[in-house]
Interface confidence: low
C-alpha cells in the first residue's frame, strides 16, 4: 500500500481551523492478524529524508494522537483530547486519514507528517509516510480562508517503506 497526500501546502489565516489529510492507497489486508497504526507528528525537511525527525504537535506526542484498527475501519482520538488541545485525528472507511487543528496560531506553521504502520503480528511491519506544509499567516496578506495546493502526482504517492 501507499500513502498519498492530496495537498502538499495549506495556507491558512490565524484563528482558522484546518484539516490535514493523508490517504491510504492500494490493497489493504483486512486479516485478523493485521493492524494499522496511524499517527501524526511535526517534522522538518531533513537533508536525507523528510519526516525522519519526529516532534509533538501542540505538545501531544504521536502516542497521544495515534489510531489503531484493522483494515479500513473508522477510528478517532478521544473527544476530550481534541477539545483540550484543539486537535483530533480520525480515519474513515475509505482510507482517508486526517488531523484537524482548531484556532490556528503562527506557532502551528511547519511541516506535518502522517505515518501509517502495517503490522502483521509477530511477522513483519511495513511503514509509509506522507508530508505536507502548513503556513499560518496574519495581517493584510493572509487569505480569508485556508487555501490548499495540490501535490504533484510524484509527491502525493511518495512512500517510505520499512
Amino acid at each position: 500500500f501507499k500513502v498519498a497526500t492530496p495537498y502538499s501546502l495549506y495556507v491558512c489565516p490565524e484563528g482558522q481551523n484546518v484539516t490535514l489529510t493523508c490517504r491510504l492507497l492500494g490493497p489493504v489486508d483486512k486479516g485478523h492478524d493485521v493492524t494499522f497504526y496511524k499517527t501524526w507528528y511535526r517534522s522538518s525537511r531533513g537533508e536525507v529524508q523528510t519526516c525522519s525527525e519526529r516532534r509533538p504537535i501542540r505538545n501531544l506526542t504521536f502516542q497521544d494522537l495515534h489510531l489503531h484498527h484493522g483494515g479500513h475501519q473508522a477510528a478517532n482520538t478521544s473527544h476530550d483530547l481534541a477539545q483540550r488541545h484543539g486537535l483530533e485525528s480520525a480515519s474513515d472507511h475509505h482510507g482517508n486519514f486526517s488531523i484537524t487543528m482548531r484556532n490556528l496560531t503562527l506557532l502551528d506553521s511547519g511541516l506535518y507528517c502522517c505515518l501509517v504502520v502495517e503490522i502483521r503480528h509477530h511477522h513483519s511491519e511495513h511503514r509509509v509516510h506522507g508530508a505536507m506544509e502548513l503556513q499560518v499567516q496574519t495581517g493584510k496578506d493572509a487569505p480569508s480562508n485556508c487555501v490548499v495546493y495540490p501535490s504533484s502526482s510524484q509527491d502525493s504517492e511518495n512512500i517510505t517503506a520499512a
Epitope: D64, I119, H121, A162
Partner: antibody
Amino acid sequence: QVQLVQSGAEVKKPGSSVKVSCKASGGTFSSYAISWVRQAPGQGLEWMGGIIPIFGTANYAQKFQGRVTITADESTSTAYMELSSLRSEDTAVYYCARSSYGWSYEFDYWGQGTLVTVSS
Amino acid sequence: DIQMTQSPSSLSASVGDRVTITCRASQSIRTDLNWYQQKPGKAPKLLIYSASSLQSGVPSRFSGSGSGTDFTLTISSLQPEDFATYYCQQNERTPITFGQGTKVEIK
C-alpha cells in the same frame, strides 16, 4: 513466542545511575511499545515510561521526567532504561513490558524483573 | 493524570467463593482498562484487556465488565491458585496508571 530477558540485579550508591536492559526475541520489535514498570518492595506497580522503537523517542511519566532515559536499539532488539540520581526510594524491581497489540499498553509480555538496590 | 482507585485493598475469601473487585477511574477511559494478577516474586500476568476481553489462556472463571469510569473484575469460583494481588490499569492515554492493588487472601 515473544520473550523479554532483562539484565541482572544491581546494587548502587545514592546519587549514581543504573542502566537496565531488556532484550526481546520471538517477534518483530520496532513497532511495539516497550514500557518500564517498577515495583518497590511491598508496593504497587508504577509506570515509568515507554518507547516505540521506530520513533526512537520516549514518553515518560512526569514523576521521572529528567531522571529517566528510555532508549531502544533496533539492531539488537533491546530496550534500555537508565535512571540517574538514585536515592534509597528507587530500590525496586524494574520490569520491562510489552503488548502484542502494537502501540497499545496492555502488557501481555513481561521481563523477569531486575532488582535494583540503592544503598550507601 | 488519570487516577485509578481499587476497592477493597484486601479481602479474605474461601475456595469456591465468588469474588468481585472494583476499579474507578478519575475520568472516563472508555473501555481502555486491563486487569492483572501478580503472585509474590513474579511478574504480573494479564487477565482481562479492554475491560471485558479474556486474555488467551486465562480461565473463564475470570471476567471483567464496565466502561467509562467504573469497572469490575469477577472471579466466579475462587480456586487455590487465584490467591494473589490484582491490579487494574488504564491505557486510555499516557501516563499509564495502575490501581493500588487488591490482595486476595485465604479465609
